[in-house]
Interface confidence: medium
């Protein structure tokens, strides 16, 4: 039993770290493998994660982490029975993948603008809450060439969009993702898309 691609781990920096790795042949991850993890800290408990299959030879483990702080380092050991396949460490603050923004909604706004709003996926308690910036992708459902990308670098999870920048009568979809620049994070997954019809007529008629 061998590891082809060693574990790559990311943390949402609030409750979960996810590690993924690839074996050298199709493997029943949950039956054959265990990932043990322990905060590199005197007296901390050793935990075991039972991996699941993502593909035939790709295993994924989701590990609950508790109130991560910057200095936390986890010792990771991948076992196949009594055989140690891989050993390494993981620092959640250095491998952040933010949670996906939620509840993306489009509202008609004054002066022929659309107001896109979504929710910050972190509670105010969390260090990432005030660190997120967003990318909004707006695309024409019937014209793959007609799309726009907006970077929202201010703190509020909103974007105002002039209706005149979009084709009249066309159906548009928007989705949003987040990243934490100060943590040099990866991008979050995209939110589910929300769709609306772009009209120029006065809003009162709709």
């Amino acid at each position: 039993v061998k590891v082809l691609h060693e574990p790559s781990c990311f943390s949402d920096y609030i409750s979960t770290s996810v590690c993924q790795w690839k074996m050298d042949h199709p493997t029943n991850c949950s039956a054959e493998l265990r990932l043990s993890y322990q905060l590199d800290f005197m007296g901390s408990e050793n935990h075991t994660c039972v991996p699941e299959n993502r593909e035939d030879s790709v295993c994924v483990c989701s590990m609950p982490i508790d109130d991560a702080v910057e200095a936390d380092v986890y010792q990771l050991d991948l076992w196949a029975g009594q055989q140690l396949l891989w050993s390494g460490s993981f620092q959640p603050s250095k491998h952040v993948k933010p949670r996906t923004p939620g509840n993306l909604t489009v509202y008609p706004n004054i002066s022929h603008t659309w107001l896109l709003m979504w929710t910050n996926p972190y509670p105010t308690e969390n260090h990432l809450h005030s660190e997120l910036t967003y990318m909004v992708n707006v695309s024409n459902d019937n014209d793959p060439e007609d799309f726009k990308v907006y970077n929202v670098t201010y703190m509020g999870p909103t974007l105002r969009l002039a209706a005149s920048t979009l084709k009249s009568g066309a159906s548009y979809s928007a989705r949003v993702r987040a990243w934490a620049q100060t943590y040099n994070s990866t991008w979050s997954d995209w939110s589910p898309s929300t769709t609306w019809l772009n009209y120029y007529e006065p809003w009162e008629q709709h």
Epitope: E70, S93, P123, T124, E125, N126, H127, H129, T182, Y183
Partner: antibody, heavy 118, light 112 residues
Amino acid sequence: QVQLQQPGAELVKPGASVKLSCKASGYTFTNYWIHWMKQRPGRGLEWIGRIDPNSGGTKYNEKFKSKATLTVDKPSITAYMQLSSLTSEDSAVYYCAAFGSTYGFAYWGQGTLVTVSA
Amino acid sequence: DIVMSQSPSSLAVSAGEKVTMSCKSSQSLLNSRTRKNYLAWYQQKPGQSPKLLIYWASTRESGVPDRFTGSGSGTDFTLTISSVQAEDLAVYYCKQSYNLYTFGGGTKLEIK
């Protein structure tokens, strides 16, 4: 405006339990964690723990793990803290606070004075 | 656990004077990524709940008079009241939120 309403006082006997309430208004209850603090007369403040009203998830100060139990009732937008096996050491004012965060606890209840006495 | 120590435990000043009080933490509260110090200051007047004055060590909470200033970084922090008013009679607490939450023992401000 944001308000956290707590009863003024509770008198309880040693060995008994008491359930303190904290009713929220003026904001979306599930948006902010509720924190609980203890303050004994003439003493400083101690953080007891917090609860996420959305999920019910809790986190406790180790010192209070076997003393306090935090719960919420979403329909009544109320958070509760049950204190068990009370002794005179538990006589204190207990505060709930919201918008507890890396910013600060911006909203506080008025506090409930718990007196443990035979 | 992070331990917070405040000094002095009490002080008495006349109205109009400048006051400084200190708060020290047993480990750094500076997040090297966000460059924020997770340190807040609270004011508790007699018979009242604590009130948030300063967060992130130096950011004044909305509505707080500008005579209150927070400073410091890492493990050493200071709250300064530039010109004490009679209504500033209170106990002042610092609190860390770098790793869970711990309050200092408080500094009691009395007006002569």
